[in-house]
């Protein structure tokens, strides 16, 4: 049977917590990604940003999980209007910001 959306979001939060807690060296060698607007379409926007990071095993599971939340196919180099114009941040900061936002969505019961 399909995993309930609440459980899937919980799994994603757990994975992001693990990334932030287990981080020793700079995450993904300090790679920079486009900052995103967290107010709408957060899963696809996050995936569109993170998919451009290659060769970083630490976020591969996150990329796969975000893919499960995003209803359309996302490929590298693809950007939606949800990107914050011309602003790049480190992957570590991106993950922290995403985690804070997803935890709030979870607490509010907004799983879709």
């Amino acid at each position: 049977s399909p995993v309930p959306r609440s459980t899937a979001l919980k799994e994603l939060i757990e994975e992001l917590v693990n990334i932030t807690q287990n981080q020793k060296a700079p995450l993904c060698n300090g790679s920079m990604v486009w900052s995103i607007n967290l107010t709408a379409g957060v899963y696809c926007a996050a995936l569109e940003s993170l998919i451009n990071v290659s060769g970083c095993s630490a976020i591969e599971k996150t990329q796969r999980m975000l893919n499960g939340f995003c209803p359309h196919k996302v490929s590298a180099g693809q950007f939606s209007s949800l990107r914050v114009r011309d602003t790049k941040i480190e992957v570590a900061q991106f993950v922290k910001d995403l985690l804070v936002h997803l935890k709030k969505l979870f607490r509010e019961g907004r799983f879709n």
Partner: antibody, heavy 123, light 107 residues
Framework: EVTLRESGPGLVKPTQTLTLTCTLY??????????VDWIRQPPGKGLEWLAH???????RYNPALKSRLTISKDTSKNQVVLKLTSVDPVDTATYYC???????????????WGQGTLVTVSS | DIQMTQSPSSLSASVGDRVTISCRAS??????LNWYQQKPGKAPKLLIF???MKPRGVPSRFSGSGSGTDYTLTISSLQPEDIATYYC?????????FGGGTKVEIK
């Protein structure tokens, strides 16, 4: 020391609104990751979760009672208030407030409880 | 809503006995399972959280285990002060739900 203390009317008439107050000691609901729950227990029965409020005013309710429940906080008084409208004798119970702390993963585990306040609904 | 089913509803055991209480969730709760002890006339007390973690001050004879939908509370050597009702609770997501309780008595 972390302590929670419930206060309520003791006796309420059917159809009236029950107002319960939980006063928090030893921690503040203005602190990130803090939450407070309300739980009730009818005499001789099990525990039923009613509502929850987080430090940032995010609220959740038991769907079976949502239309009758309102949870709010007064950070200046370090209090959480629960209102239950249109009470009925089946709402007779001991009402507890309890603290939840979210750390890392989001736990909903109530680590400190008040002593409870018995509310009887009767005419 | 996630339903929590506890068994047995009551049990009687001798001092020193090993006691196990079971709790089953209606769906996978990913180890977000808490146990509470409620002594007569008192408020519940958190005994175990996140399946097997213990708050400070909980005696070592209490332990928790399980995964997925099935969880267990074990008292390795029952003591007279353990007379109480024990409740499981899922902490995955609201609405938070409790098991019906297990009343533990001494033979």
């Amino acid at each position: 020391e972390v302590t929670l203390r419930e206060s309520g009317p003791g006796l309420v008439k059917p159809t009236q609104t029950l107002t319960l107050t939980c006063t928090l000691y030893g921690f503040s609901l203005s602190t990130s990751d803090m939450g407070v729950d309300w739980i009730r227990q009818p005499p001789g029965k099990g525990l039923e979760w009613l509502a929850h409020i987080w430090w940032d005013d995010v609220k959740r309710y038991n769907p079976a009672l949502k239309s009758r429940l309102t949870i709010s906080k007064d950070t200046s008084k370090n209090q959480v208030v629960l209102k239950l409208t249109s009470v009925d004798p089946v709402d007779t119970a001991t009402y507890y407030c309890a603290r939840t702390v979210s750390s890392g993963y989001i736990y909903y585990a109530m680590d400190y409880w008040g002593q409870g306040t018995l509310v009887t609904v009767s005419s | 809503d996630i339903q929590m089913t506890q068994s047995p509803s009551s049990l009687s055991a001798s001092v020193g006995d090993r006691v196990t209480i079971s709790c089953r969730a209606s769906q996978d709760i990913r180890n977000y399972l808490n146990w509470y002890q409620q002594k007569p006339g008192k408020a519940p007390k958190l005994l175990i959280f996140y399946t097997s973690m213990k708050p400070r001050g909980v005696p070592s004879r209490f332990s928790g285990s399980g995964s997925g939908t099935d969880y267990t509370l074990t008292i390795s050597s029952l003591q007279p002060e353990d007379i109480a009702t024990y409740y499981c609770q899922q902490g995955l997501t609201p609405p938070l739900t409790f098991g019906g309780g297990t009343k533990v008595e001494i033979k």
